[in-house]
Interface confidence: low
């Protein structure tokens, strides 16, 4: 009598997550009497996947009709495969006993699961940074298999090179995660810029997944301040203008001070956007020169996006001014801070 053979023809099978996996097994004889069982893994810790004699295994079905007595095909199909199903599966013939006695095992079939990476999630810095500073963006994607994966960063279509990427875990696993950090140098023109994290994987069939982040969430463009005086009006009133330009985000508070005393406070709202995404704002203050005996020190104080206030001052010389319209006055600039605030006197 020839020796019983348990044949598992495929050494490995690769299946996409969500699909069904067919694990083939045939036996050379139905003798001796006893069940066929499928296990994942070998040794004492192996997991019973299917018992062709009895039991309830909702995701597993027999490939061929096991009710036919001449059936020697004990292949199974596992539905709705997930990465957790990866492993080596063994078709094992038992001789009926108490307990059943293992007779012969197939060589095993390694099931690997091709799982798509999750949509990349890009997160930016917790606080805004100003132009000429470098900020970090992080991209994460999870649950993919096999481990090989490609991740690229782009800023406005140009690939970034200052990138650090890690795939975890380093060893064998049912699925993997990728985390990548890109360092991006901000410029004042980056309000409309975008960074893209692009993930390519064998499961995506050449159509990479993309995650995006807008630099508008990460950048702060501080304003330029310029205070100027218009010509003296006939009613001895001087119109002083504070021009706040090229700032982002819009959150801005402007306060006028006359000789250090608050004259008026305004909040920027519903401003038109410049082409580069920044905003401009102009505020006017009418100063009645005849009401002052001494020079008037006007200060335009701007608080932008919760940052320390930036001042621009202007002195209206009362003693020197003639009554006629168009006469000159002297101006004084003070209080510029370390930011790039450029402003001339009027």
């Amino acid at each position: 009598e020839e020796e019983l053979q348990v044949i598992q023809p495929e050494k490995s099978v690769s299946v996409a997550a969500g699909d069904s996996a067919t694990l083939n097994c045939t036996v050379s004889s139905l003798i001796p009497v006893g069940p066929i069982q499928w296990f994942r893994g070998a040794g004492p810790g192996r997991e019973l996947i299917y018992n062709l004699k009895e039991g309830h295994f909702p995701r597993v079905t027999a490939v061929s009709d096991p009710t036919k007595r001449n059936n020697m095909d004990f292949s199974i199909r596992i539905s709705n495969i997930t990465p957790a199903d990866a492993g080596t599966y063994y078709c094992v013939k038992f001789r009926k006993g108490s307990p059943d006695v293992e007779l012969k095992s197939g060589a095993g079939t390694e099931l690997s699961v091709r799982a798509k990476p999750s949509a990349p999630v890009v997160s930016g810095p917790a606080v805004r940074a100003t132009a000429e500073h470098t900020v970090s963006f992080t991209c994460e994607s999870h649950g993919f298999s096999p481990r090989d994966i490609t991740l690229k960063w782009f800023k406005n279509g140009n690939e970034l090179s200052d990138v650090q990427t890690n795939v975890d875990p380093a060893g064998k696993s049912v699925s993997y995660s990728i985390r990548s950090t890109a360092r991006v140098l901000l410029t004042r023109r980056d309000v409309h810029s975008q960074v893209i994290c692009e993930v390519a994987h064998v499961t995506l069939q050449g159509d990479p997944l993309r995650g995006t982040a807008n630099l508008s969430e990460a950048i702060r463009v501080p304003p330029f301040l310029e205070v100027t005086q218009q010509s003296m009006r006939a009613d001895n009133q001087v119109n002083v203008t504070c021009q706040v330009t090229k700032f982002y985000p819009q959150r801005l508070q402007l306060t006028w001070l006359e000789n250090g005393n608050v004259s008026r406070t305004e909040m920027a709202s519903a401003l038109p956007e410049n082409k580069d995404g920044t905003y401009n704002w102009t505020s006017w203050l009418l100063v009645n020169v005849s009401a002052h005996r001494d020079d008037v020190k006007l200060t335009c104080q701007v608080e932008h996006d919760g940052q320390p206030a930036v001042n621009k001052s202007f002195s209206v010389k009362v003693s020197a001014h003639p009554k006629e319209q168009g006469s000159n006055t002297a101006a004084e600039n003070t209080g510029t801070n370390e930011r790039n605030i450029y402003g001339g006197s009027g």
Partner: antibody
């Protein structure tokens, strides 16, 4: 609940015909081998016919050429067309489901009586 | 066809008794043997398949054994509801065949 309900039995003259039906509920009939088993009054069980999941059919020698087993998947029903009936076909006819793995009978219907008499 | 022979044809026993019914096949049927219980006027009930495996819901007082040609059904402790007719059946090849039955009666 998994259930088999037979119908169609009755009194028929020798040489006549009868069609037995078996309505399955709680499972998909086409996924199982299905059988007809009969029992003459006061006698033992006799396997009559089977239909496999692939549509293959089997008969005991005494009914070959006279009985036809079939199923209608859309109605989840099994049938036994009995022609050229004889007195020795008189019996209670049971519809039976074969088990998933080895065709061991697991579910039986309540039976329907067929009487062949003039 | 494979012939199935049961013995005894009838058996008297008392509540609490342990009884054994045997079934012999005319040729090797591996372990493709089933046992059924039938009460008067009722459909048979499946008890055991593949010679020794209990169907769902069947109490463990029923047990089967055997392989090849000789099989047994044992009821460990008879209860009043166990008095019935028992049939064995081979299902290794068509035509499937039954034993003639064993009538278990109360003594």
């Amino acid at each position: 609940e998994v259930q088999l309900v037979e119908s169609g039995g009755g009194l028929v003259q020798p040489g006549g015909s009868l069609r037995l039906s078996c309505a399955a509920s709680g499972f998909t009939l086409s996924s199982y081998d299905m059988h007809w088993v009969r029992q003459a009054p006061g006698k033992g069980l006799e396997w009559v016919s089977a239909i496999g999941t692939a549509g293959d059919t089997y008969y005991t020698g005494s009914v070959k050429g006279r009985f036809t087993i079939s199923r209608e998947n859309a109605k989840n029903s099994l049938y036994l067309q009995m022609n050229s009936l004889r007195a020795d076909d008189t019996a209670v006819y049971y519809c039976v489901r074969g088990g998933v793995w080895d065709d061991a009978f697991d579910i039986w219907g309540q039976g329907t009586m067929v009487t062949v008499s003039s | 066809d494979i012939q199935m022979t049961q013995s005894p044809s009838s058996l008297s026993a008392s509540v609490g008794d342990r009884v054994t019914i045997t079934c012999r096949a005319s040729q090797d049927i591996n372990n493709y043997l089933a046992w059924f219980q039938q009460k008067p006027g009722k459909a048979p009930k499946s008890l055991i398949y593949t010679a020794s495996s209990l169907h769902s819901g069947v109490p463990s007082k029923f047990s089967g054994s055997g392989s090849g040609t000789d099989f047994t059904l044992t009821i460990s402790s008879l209860q009043p509801e166990d008095f019935a007719t028992y049939y064995c059946q081979q299902y290794v090849s068509y035509p499937y065949t039954f034993g003639q039955g064993t009538k278990l009666e109360i003594k």
